[in-house]
């Protein structure tokens, strides 16, 4: 704020007074000054800042005939409807030559019924959970004493005797209303009524009960919900192998989640149609007639690996003397995990079955015992993952190879034992 210098005497012979009244009051602040020569423009300051749009009038009257004689200047600032924004310290400011002069200050304040600076706000709280409400009122006149009311019932014997600016509520079991009365010498003002809606507490102990490659069974412990029974719980699952990563407190999942509703009790749900061997994050919230609880933190879970759902494809087996050449292609059906390799079994009509682990190769040459006179030799192949073997192929008979003939190819016709995999939501 500009400061008057002491080098020359201040021209002010009258300073702004004080105005204190109720909202809506009209009043006038005045500054009076006596200057020699050309009268200056009088500016008004509020709390040190020039009021650019002040409703002010300036009257100036010469005290003599000569322009260089003294002038009396009166500046009047009108406050038409006193508001909180009008309150503060007022001063006049004039520039005379190279100097700035500021009048002594006057003050504008409010006096009347208490005025609320802060009122209780609507909010939701979990059942039986402590919270605070705020209420702040000012005069003048001071003091202002507060009285809190819950469901229109006073929480203290008299204003000022109970909690004041902050009301600590240890917990609620039903939706309630709170208001605050402000009392001063002029009377009473009542705040807005805040509705505090009691929601269920966040469920606890969300955990896995059982895991299947395409489904997870989860359970949780419900939180308290006050006098309002839980109507249902909602479980969300989202893929978390996209590299985005869900932080514990992240408000929203990166993708549209799979959402399922569970009737309660029991507080358990089977979540199906999932990808095998896939990381997910899951969370749960429970709802009463008053609304939903907050979500639990995201819990990382993973579906286990499954066995391949189908046998290898396009198996061909040809015999040339004491050697048999077998090759195949990867199963078309979902592997439900990481393919670790193939197992091959061959068997003659009257000979025991021979089982081999081929690894990840898709062909093998078999050295047959003896002169190759074993009759009706058949070959089966299965793919396997860490979870175990997938279904074996149908037995493929060993064909004798004739030069100039194309090797026979046996198409599998047997359907997989489980239904074809579908992705209804992915």
């Amino acid at each position: 704020a500009p400061r008057g210098t002491q080098a020359e005497e201040s021209p002010f012979v009258g300073n702004p007074g004080n105005i204190t009244g109720a909202r809506g009051l009209t009043g006038t602040l005045r500054c009076q000054l006596q200057v020699q020569g050309e009268p200056p423009e009088v500016h008004w300051l509020r709390d040190g800042q020039i009021l650019e749009l002040a409703d002010s009038t300036q009257t100036q009257v010469p005290l003599g005939e000569d322009e260089q004689d003294d002038w009396i200047v009166v500046s009047q600032l009108r406050i038409t409807s006193l508001q909180l924004s009008d309150t503060g310290q007022y001063q006049c400011l004039v520039f005379l030559g190279h100097q700035t002069f500021v009048s002594q200050p006057g003050y504008v304040g409010l006096e009347g019924l208490p005025y609320f600076l802060e009122e209780p706000e609507d909010r939701t709280v979990a059942a039986n959970t402590p919270f605070n409400l705020s209420c702040q009122a000012q005069g003048p006149p001071e003091p202002v004493d507060l009285l809190w009311l819950q469901d229109a019932v006073p929480l203290a014997t008299a204003p000022g005797h109970g909690p004041q600016r902050s009301l600590h509520v240890p917990g609620l079991n039903k939706t309630s209303s709170f208001s605050c009365e402000a009392h001063n010498a002029k009377g009473v003002t009542t705040s807005r009524t805040a509705t505090i809606t009691v929601l269920p507490q966040q469920p606890r102990n969300l955990h896995l009960v059982s895991r299947q490659p395409t489904e997870l069974e989860v359970a949780w412990t419900p939180g308290l919900s006050g006098i309002y029974p839980l109507t249902h719980c909602t479980l969300q699952a989202v893929l978390s192998d996209d590299g985005m990563g869900i932080q514990a407190g992240e408000p929203d999942p990166p993708e549209e989640p799979l959402t399922s509703q569970a009737s309660v009790p029991p507080h358990q749900l089977r979540l199906g149609s999932l990808h095998p061997h896939t990381p997910y994050h899951i969370r749960v919230a429970c709802t009463s007639s008053q609304g939903p609880s907050s979500w639990t933190h995201w819990l990382p879970v993973e579906t286990p690996e499954g066995v391949p759902l189908g046998p290898p494809e396009n198996i061909s087996a040809t015999r040339n003397g004491s050697q048999a050449f077998v090759h195949w292609q990867e199963p078309r059906a979902p592997l439900q995990g990481t393919l670790l390799g193939y197992r091959l079994a061959y068997q003659g009509q009257d000979t025991p079955e021979v089982l081999m682990d081929i690894g990840l190769r898709q062909e093998v040459t078999l050295e047959l015992q003896g002169d190759g006179s074993v009759s009706n030799l058949t070959v089966c192949v299965a793919a396997y993952t860490a979870a175990g073997d997938g279904p074996w192929s149908l037995p493929v008979p060993l064909e004798a190879w004739r030069p100039g003939q194309a090797q026979p190819v046996h198409q599998l016709v047997k359907e997989p034992s489980t239904p074809a995999f579908s992705w209804p939501w992915w």
């Epitope: 012979v13 009258g14 300073n15 006038t28 005045r30 009076q32 009257t59 009257v61 009396i72 009166v74």
Partner: antibody, heavy 119, light 107 residues
Framework: EVQLVQSGAEVKKPGATVKISCKVS????????MNWIRQPPGKGLEWIGL????????SYNQKFKGRVTISADKSISTAYLQWSSLKASDTAMYYC?????????????WGQGTLVTVS | DIQMTQSPSSLSASVGDRVTITCKAS??????VAWYQQKPGQAPRLLIY???TRHTGVPSRFSGSGSGTEFTLTISSLQPDDFATYYC?????????FGQGTKVEIK
């Protein structure tokens, strides 16, 4: 509490000079102005002049200029009115009065008065 | 110099009466009018300044109004303590001038 205490009554001969004092307590002496007003017996109020103790600046009623001197001693928070060439018509109660913060020429606190009799 | 013409010079009234005293300035004094009450043997006492602002401790039955050159002091309900002489004064510019006074007497 603001108090203005004036010197005691004076009886003077015509042509003499009188100097009366006004001691201020209870507020900052050089904040506003000190006015001098007189009131002849049974008559109205008449402004004599003023002084701004902060800088010693004075303003006089032209009617009395030349016979009146207003001064102040900041160190003892006292204002003075000196009147020379007294006439019988100068017999009056003389008041000092403090200028109001919001308009130094409106007078919010008054001394008890000093009666000057010229005869 | 500004002249202040006060009327009436005296009036008789009873306790509880509404009393009005007027003062006319010879030129516009921009609301710079004060009113004083003086009782016998006492110094004047400031009642109103800047036309309508009550001085500290002055009862609310005293009010000032007016604009430009015509100003009024009103006592809404006369009390026994209010019988005195009342003066107006312009505090706009030196030389400061007072009205001749209005004596309020018991009827």
């Amino acid at each position: 509490e603001v108090q203005l205490v004036q010197s005691g009554a004076e009886v003077k001969k015509p042509g003499a000079t009188v100097k009366i004092s006004c001691k201020v307590s209870g507020y900052s002496f050089w904040g506003a102005t000190m006015n001098w007003i007189r009131q002849p017996p049974g008559k109205g109020l008449e402004w004599i002049g003023l002084i701004k103790p902060s800088n010693g600046g004075t303003s006089y009623n032209q009617k009395f200029k030349g016979r009146v001197t207003i001064s102040a001693d900041k160190s003892i928070s006292t204002a003075y009115l000196q009147w020379s060439s007294l006439k019988a018509s100068d017999t009056a109660m003389y008041y000092c009065a403090h200028g109001h913060y919001e308009s130094y020429e409106a007078m919010d606190y008054w001394g008890q008065g000093t009666l000057v009799t010229v005869s | 110099d500004i002249q202040m013409t006060q009327s009436p010079s005296s009036l008789s009234a009873s306790v509880g009466d509404r009393v009005t005293i007027t003062c006319k300035a010879s030129q516009d004094v921009v609301s710079a009018v004060a009113w004083y009450q003086q009782k016998p043997g006492q110094a004047p006492r400031l009642l109103i300044y800047w036309q309508d602002t009550r001085h500290t401790g002055v009862p609310s039955r005293f009010s000032g109004s007016g604009s430009g050159t015509e100003f009024t002091l009103t006592i809404s309900s006369l009390q026994p303590d209010d019988f005195a002489t009342y003066y107006c004064q312009e505090h706009f510019s030196p030389p400061l001038t007072f009205g001749q006074g209005t004596k309020v007497e018991i009827k």
